[in-house]
Amino acid sequence: LSVQQGPNLLQVRQGSQATLVCQVDQATAWERLRVKWTKDGAILCQPYITNGSLSLGVCGPQGRLSWQAPSHLTLQLDPVSLNHSGAYVCWAAVEIPELEEAEGNITRLFVDPDDPTQNRNRIASFPG
């Protein structure tokens, strides 16, 4: 089981949207995938994916989850608030036939205040 997460760094303006992507790769077929998104070490949500279906659509404040088979889990924050700034990690596990767990590298989200006098560019860098 491996998890690739992106982007590494994401800078957005308050009130806009931020999209974090988690790619879960498993060599063998799985029946149930458990995933967690954490922010600064605290669990935002922990849905299950069975038969290509997410058990949960909400993930933390203003967070929406989506699953694109075979491997892409997306967390969309919309609208983004200053409180969304932090370090996000995607974790995944399968229990069958053996317990396997993996987590992605950190996505650091920076949220700029909605202040027209601060004209900073958005940054989005993906691994690789």
């Epitope: 149930r32 669990i43 949500c45 069975t50 069958i96």
Partner: antibody, heavy 120, light 107 residues
Framework: QVQLQESGPGLVKPSQTLSLTCTVT?????????WNWLRQHPGKGLEWIGY???????SYNPSHKSRVTISRDTSKNQFFLKLSSVTAADTAVYYC?????????????WGQGTTVTVSS | DIQLTQSPSFLSASVGDRVTITCKAS??????VAWYQQKPGKAPKLLIY???TRHTGVPSRFSGSGSGTDFTLTISSLQPEDFATYYC?????????FGGGTKVEIK
């Protein structure tokens, strides 16, 4: 309404294999859910042993993995627990229970429990 | 394994009392916590899952709250049939584990 009923010998000798059956009525074990075994030592808390899911795949508590097998007979709508090389520490009330495999692992339906004593 | 510590382990209360039982997890479990009621010689019954969702048919006097590591089961007005032992369970980390139980007895 789903009902679960455990059955099996109440007395097992040390080093032997404990075998229990859970018979499910009112719901097909192949339709959905995970079908669990748990136990409760006398006067103590609950311990999850493992499950077999609706698709027939099993998952076990690592603490007992080397000794546990959970299987099923879909024609009889039953699932089974085998625990090998038992000792007195395996004396407990054993429960079968159903959990929502697609949404959470809370146990929403239980059997009444069966007491197993390991003694020579 | 994730450890769940319940407190108190024993509680003496009267009919009509408000009762609060706490469950502390050894690590963050989000809201993946369930609560059960067990009476002597009987199987546990599910009361609450996902920390705060009442199971079908459970009276509204039972409520659950909390997230992360600290969880609470509250019985707003204790009824005679509520004297029992209560357990929390986490389903965030594998294997699923239970708290040691809180026995609620008649004062």
């Amino acid at each position: 309404q789903v009902q679960l009923q455990e059955s099996g010998p109440g007395l097992v000798k040390p080093s032997q294999t404990l075998s229990l059956t859970c018979t499910v009525t009112g719901y097909s074990i192949t339709s959905d859910f995970a079908w669990n075994w748990l136990r409760q030592h006398p006067g103590k808390g609950l311990e999850w042993i493992g499950y077999i899911n609706y698709a027939g795949s099993s998952s076990y508590n690592p603490s007992h993995k080397s000794r546990v097998t959970i299987s099923r007979d879909t024609s009889k709508n039953q699932f089974f627990l085998k625990l090998s090389s038992v000792t007195a520490a395996d004396t407990a009330v054993y429960y079968c229970a159903r959990s929502n495999y697609r949404n959470d692992d809370a146990m929403d339906s239980w059997g009444q429990g069966t007491t197993v004593t390991v003694s020579s | 394994d994730i450890q769940l510590t319940q407190s108190p382990s024993f509680l003496s209360a009267s009919v009509g009392d408000r009762v609060t039982i706490t469950c502390k997890a050894s690590q963050d479990v989000g809201t993946a916590v369930a609560w059960y009621q067990q009476k002597p010689g009987k199987a546990p019954k599910l009361l609450i899952y996902w920390a705060s969702t009442r199971h079908t048919g459970v009276p509204s006097r039972f409520s659950g709250s909390g997230s992360g590591t600290d969880f609470t089961l509250t019985i707003s007005s204790l009824q005679p049939e509520d004297f029992a032992t209560y357990y929390c369970q986490q389903f965030s980390g594998f294997p699923w584990t239970f708290g040691g139980g809180t026995k609620v007895e008649i004062k």
